[in-house]
Interface confidence: medium
């Protein structure tokens, strides 16, 4: 018979014959022959291969370097890489999460619209009329101005986006 020119899925062509690929989590140590199957070996403890393959070396698991603010989010297996994320208060600088930066704080006059996660930074928004923020914070939202009326008080000093209103007693008319 004619030697094959293409092989089935999960096979590869070598020396004019189709050999089985190694399954995820295993590396190739020996191609198949006319008499023997492909021989594969499990990846080592800190290694992985995530596809059907004919690789002779497994890939090393990613190292989550604590010096870069990284920690392990999901431990790697023989078939998957380690997933890193950032320590609390930090977030990844890229999708690959190779290093971390401190979460941004929202300045006075701005509040937190969305709290940062391990992969995204803080999103700030300016405090609209009726709201204020007098601190630099990565957690605080804009607070509503105090309602003087509900306390039977009057506004003595108007609020801004950075300060609350100042309430005071109503002026009593003297008899």
């Amino acid at each position: 018979p004619e030697p094959p020119t293409a092989c089935r899925e999960k096979q590869y062509l070598i020396n004019s014959q189709c050999c089985s690929l190694c399954q995820p989590g295993q590396k190739l140590v020996s191609d198949c022959t006319e008499f023997t199957e492909t021989e594969c070996l499990p990846c080592g403890e800190s290694e992985f291969l995530d596809t059907w393959n004919r690789e002779t070396h497994c890939h090393q698991h990613k190292y989550c370097d604590p010096n870069l603010g990284l920690r392990v989010q999901q431990k790697g297996t023989s078939e998957t890489d380690t997933i890193c994320t950032c320590e609390e208060g930090w977030h990844c600088t890229s999708e690959a999460c190779e290093s971390c930066v401190l979460h941004r704080s929202c300045s006075p006059g701005f509040g937190v619209k969305q709290i940062a996660t391990g992969v995204s930074d803080t999103i700030c928004e300016p405090c609209p009329v009726g709201f204020f923020s007098n601190v630099s914070s990565a957690f605080e939202k804009c607070h509503p101005w105090t309602s003087c009326e509900t306390k039977d008080l009057v506004v003595q000093q108007a609020g801004t986006n950075k300060t609350d209103v100042v309430c005071g007693p109503q002026d009593r008319l003297r008899a």
């Epitope: 399954q23 140590v29 492909t38 021989e39 594969c40």
Partner: nanobody, 118 residues
Framework: EVQLLESGGGLVQPGGSLRLSCAAS???????NMWWARQAPGKGLEWVS?????????YYADSVKGRFTISRDNSKNTLYLQMNSLRAEDTAVYYC???????????WGQGTLVTVSS
Amino acid sequence: EVQLLESGGGLVQPGGSLRLSCAASGFTFSAYNMWWARQAPGKGLEWVSWINSTGSRTYYADSVKGRFTISRDNSKNTLYLQMNSLRAEDTAVYYCAKNWHRGRFDYWGQGTLVTVSS
């Protein structure tokens, strides 16, 4: 008929050494890659070491790396496993085998028991 006959097992103290042998017959030994595998009491079969047909390439499981050495003598149709710095967790039945694929060996011997205990 393919035959693989292991020998050399026994009782040894932690830190001790043993040399296992596997006499092969019924096939062209020098044309095949060979394996050592083991099965600890109550556990599944795990591969220990692999050697290619000429003896020029070897692989070891992480658990035995630096302590065990696989070798072969094609003129004698014999596979060897030198086991040094033995530990209690090395206690198992040791098998030599040929052609392992997808977690199966097509031929393997009857095994030799290694017990590491003080």
